[in-house]
């Protein structure tokens, strides 16, 4: 019989034969043959492996560094990782939650709409019109531009969402 | 080595006055939004005041408002919190903290007692 060039759903093609993949938490010891299975093996304490694969080695999971603020949220499993999170108080800097922070700061052309607490983090808006931010700040709301006419000047470089107007005087030469 | 040696705590009475200080160094001081934070016995992490890198805006918790002063000294690479009358309800462990604010700049913290 001809050879096959794709094979189903949880196989995978070697040697010009389809061999069946590891399941979930096992990984591969030896491709199948035309007279054996496909050989796997339990992944060891602290290793996963989460999809049907042919991987010789297993995963790692991931350690929730104690000295980065981090601590098991979930255990992890031969087909699981190990998920992190903060301590009480902390908050993730990202969605895998590798490091924590205190809060996390609001960039420049954006202000803080609500200061962290301990169960949520910073809440930033971005600076309407009128209004700017020149600076990584985790309580400063965005400040109003200067008004140069109440100062009895003129704006000579229009504000933006990071700087603020900067202003001049009049021009008194009138034509 | 980023560093903040928080001092200054101590045991005193209701009414009283403390002024902690937060030593930094391993990084420039002058420019960065500073923070203290405070943790009671057996409570969350709670934010209390901060200021800017310009040392021109400053924050307080309503629970501090009027009675704590927050301030810096750029040339000392030193940040301040002025404590007055003090109450019961601010016993606990006092931190500073910086940008980014992450745990592993995390200092040991100065114990405050108010108790008579």
């Known amino acids: 019989p001809e050879p096959p060039t794709a094979c189903r759903e949880k196989q995978y093609l070697i040697n010009s034969q389809c061999c069946s993949l590891c399941q979930p938490g096992q990984k591969l010891v030896s491709d199948c043959t035309e007279f054996t299975e496909t050989e796997c093996l339990p992944c060891g304490e602290s290793e996963f492996l989460d999809t049907w694969n042919r991987e010789t080695h297993c995963h790692q999971h991931k350690y929730c560094d104690p000295n980065l603020g981090l601590r098991v949220q979930q255990k992890g499993t031969s087909e699981t990782d190990t998920i992190c999170t903060c301590e009480e108080g902390w908050h993730c800097t990202s969605e895998a939650c590798e490091s924590c922070v205190l809060h996390r700061s609001c960039s420049p052309g954006f202000g803080v709409k609500q200061i962290a607490t301990g169960v949520s983090d910073t809440i930033c808006e971005p600076c309407p019109v009128g209004f700017f931010s020149n600076v990584s700040s985790a309580f400063e709301k965005c400040h109003p531009w200067t008004s140069c006419e109440t100062k009895d000047l003129v704006v000579q470089q229009a504000g933006t969402n990071k700087t603020d107007v900067v202003c001049g005087p009049q021009d008194r030469l009138r034509a | 080595e980023v560093q903040l040696l928080e001092s200054g705590g101590g045991l005193v009475q209701p009414g009283g006055s403390l002024r902690l200080s937060c030593a930094a160094s391993?990084?420039?001081?002058?420019?960065?939004e500073m923070w203290w934070v405070r943790q009671a016995p057996g409570k969350g992490l709670e934010r209390v005041s901060?200021?800017?890198?310009?040392?021109?805006?400053?924050y307080y918790a309503d629970s501090v408002k009027g009675r704590f002063t927050i301030s810096r000294d750029d040339s000392k690479n030193t940040l301040y919190l002025q404590m007055n009358s003090l109450r019961a309800e601010d016993t606990a462990v006092y931190y500073c903290?910086?940008?980014?604010?992450?745990?592993?700049?995390w200092g040991h913290g100065t114990l405050v007692t108010v108790s008579s």
């Open positions: 901060a200021i800017s890198g310009s040392g021109g805006s400053t």
């Open positions: 391993g990084f420039t001081f002058a420019g960065y």
């Open positions: 903290a910086k940008e980014p604010y992450s745990y592993d700049y």
